[in-house]
Amino acid sequence: LTCLGGFASPGPVPPSTALRELIEELVNITQNQKAPLCNGSMVWSINLTAGMYCAALESLINVSGCSAIEKTQRMLSGFCPHKVSAGQFSSLHVRDTKIEVAQFVKDLLLHLKKLFREGQFN
């Protein structure tokens, strides 16, 4: 929060905070998972690490009607500089390879934890 003239006004969220909040959300999803996440829906896998936030969003945006990952979708959109809509396909995806949403979220969490430890917040 930026304090100006006695009033607290929300400033831009530091990238480190945004990444930490995304990690916390993914931890919540993986820990609170009881039934198969998103009814066992499958999403495109990713085969590279550059441009990963947009690629991850492009995969997850195609999962509809799954409230458990809606917040993750919104948070990922904050990391992706362009608008992502369902049906988009990045060169980062493995076109013939789909994995379960639960595994995708779990792997995304692993990768983001590594980025956080390495100080790569953008």
Epitope: N47, L48, T49, I99, Q103, K106, L108, L110
Partner: nanobody, 118 residues
């Protein structure tokens, strides 16, 4: 689900070469550190080699340094182990495995047998 499928094992003479492959599926291979573990007959498990997710960090057991080379192709979801100057003591079942310290990210293949014998 997650699958790691090794191939390339077999019988080779001392001094010979083999290239092991590990095809990964069901998870985001490009984000995982990976490695090769072996188990010689009647012995325990031994880490042979590890490679970082980006392929830029590698580790080798002293027993294989200078002879084995680990590599990966993230576009093909495949891990490799090039084994040169093979010795009888390299005879073992070689397993492809994830090499993450984080709990819950432990995945192993079924193994491929390498026999070095004349």
């Amino acid at each position: 689900g997650v699958q790691l499928l090794e191939s390339g094992g077999g019988l080779v003479q001392p001094g010979g070469s083999l290239r092991l492959s590990c095809a990964a599926s069901g998870f985001i291979f490009a984000w995982y550190d990976m490695g090769w573990v072996r188990q010689a007959p009647g012995k325990g498990l031994e880490w042979v080699s590890r490679i970082g997710a980006h392929g830029n960090v590698t580790y080798y057991a002293d027993s294989v340094k200078g002879r084995f080379t680990i590599s990966r192709d993230n576009s093909k979801n495949t891990l490799y182990l090039q084994m040169n100057s093979l010795r009888a003591e390299d005879t073992a079942v070689y397993y492809c495995a994830t090499a993450e310290d984080e709990p819950g990210y432990d995945y192993w293949g079924q193994g491929t047998l390498v026999t070095v014998s004349s």
